[in-house]
């Protein structure tokens, strides 16, 4: 289920546990607002259940720049994927331009 | 394992204060939000407040608003709750209660006390 | 605040029967809602939350169903253990958490 911020702050538990990189579905950061006047973050596990984890805990902390680095690197994958099919699309253009000039 | 010990009940006048403490051990307290929870005679179960693990934010029944304050001590784990300006209709056992779930929807009351009789009378 | 009601106040079977408690908001709680168990002079304790999840150490004949504004709390075959008195409390929309009035299940 998606969070619900009924204008207070979501979290009133933290995770105790260990969240492995691998578990995660979606990590959401929320930044103090009118609302909620600290940081929080939310994790959704590839399960579907959501979680609440500790911002001032160096785990925390460490997850949190694995799962950015994790982000960025499959937006560069995507990125590079319709780079490609930009590349293969304009070597046909190209094909059927001179197909064109040669008929 | 868990355990939950209420602590401070008896008897009160109305109008006086007491304070309750709830004792946890067995899991970690600091990540955990808690509850008071109160019970008449014979009646059932009342919500009375609750504190999220970092105490940042504090929320009340309305029939105690403004005279009951939650309140917790992480390095001792320790909840508490002072209970001013009591009246008859507060009298009742109260549970403090561990917060199952992280944002207040999801889980329920997972571990209880065993509860602590307060009885307001003159 | 939302209400809930409990039905029946009491209910009265014998050990090995199907018990079947209702419980029903006054406004929709989604699927957040917990059933409580509580004994004469204990704490309560957890039975279902999320409406249809089993807490820790639950025996599989207690189940819990709904959403929206009705949810059921079963008991496939009753154990003696299990005559006691059961709460609903929703969570959707809180401060208060409201609990229902309770459902005495007696032994017949």
């Known amino acids: 289920t998606p969070v619900v911020r009924k204008g207070r702050c979501s979290c009133i538990s933290t995770n105790q546990g260990t969240i492995h990189l691998q578990s995660l579905k979606d990590l959401k950061q929320f930044a103090p607002s009118p609302s909620c006047e600290k940081i929080e973050i939310i994790a959704t596990l590839k399960n579907g259940v959501q979680t609440c984890l500790n911002p001032d805990s160096a785990d925390v902390k460490e997850l949190i720049k694995k799962w950015e680095k994790q982000v960025s690197q499959k937006k560069k994958q995507k990125n590079g994927k319709k780079h490609q099919k930009k590349k293969v699309l304009k070597v046909r253009k190209s094909q059927r331009s001179r197909q064109k000039k040669t008929t | 394992q868990v355990q939950l010990v209420e602590s401070g009940g008896g008897v009160v006048q109305p109008g006086r204060s007491l304070r309750l403490s709830c004792a946890a051990s067995?899991?970690?307290?600091?990540?955990?939000?808690m509850h008071w929870v109160r019970q008449a005679p014979g009646k059932g179960l009342e919500w009375v407040a609750l504190?999220?693990?970092?105490?940042?934010?504090?929320y009340y029944a309305d029939s105690v608003k403004g005279r009951f304050t939650i309140s917790r001590d992480n390095s001792k784990n320790t909840l508490y709750l002072q209970m001013n300006s009591l009246r008859a209709e507060d009298t009742a056992v109260y549970y403090c209660?561990?917060?199952?779930?992280?944002?207040?929807?999801?889980?329920?009351?997972?571990?209880w006390g065993q509860g602590i009789l307060v009885t307001v009378s003159s | 605040e939302i209400v809930l009601t409990q039905s029946p106040a009491t209910l009265s079977l014998s050990p090995g029967e199907r018990a079947t408690l209702s419980c029903r908001a006054s406004q929709s709680v989604s699927s957040y809602l917990a059933w409580y168990q509580q004994k004469p002079g204990q704490a309560p304790r957890l039975l279902i939350y999320d409406a249809s999840n089993r807490a820790t150490g639950i025996p599989a004949r207690f189940s819990g169903s709904g959403s929206g504004t009705d949810f059921t709390l079963t008991i496939s075959s009753l154990e003696p253990e299990d005559f006691a008195v059961y709460y609903c409390q929703q969570r959707s929309n809180w401060p208060p958490y409201t609990f229902g009035q309770g459902t005495k299940l007696e032994i017949k």
């Open positions: 504190i999220p693990f970092d105490g940042y934010n504090k």
């Open positions: 209660a561990r917060e199952g779930g992280y944002t207040g929807y999801d889980g329920g009351f997972d571990y």
């Open positions: 067995g899991f970690t307290f600091s990540n955990s939000a």
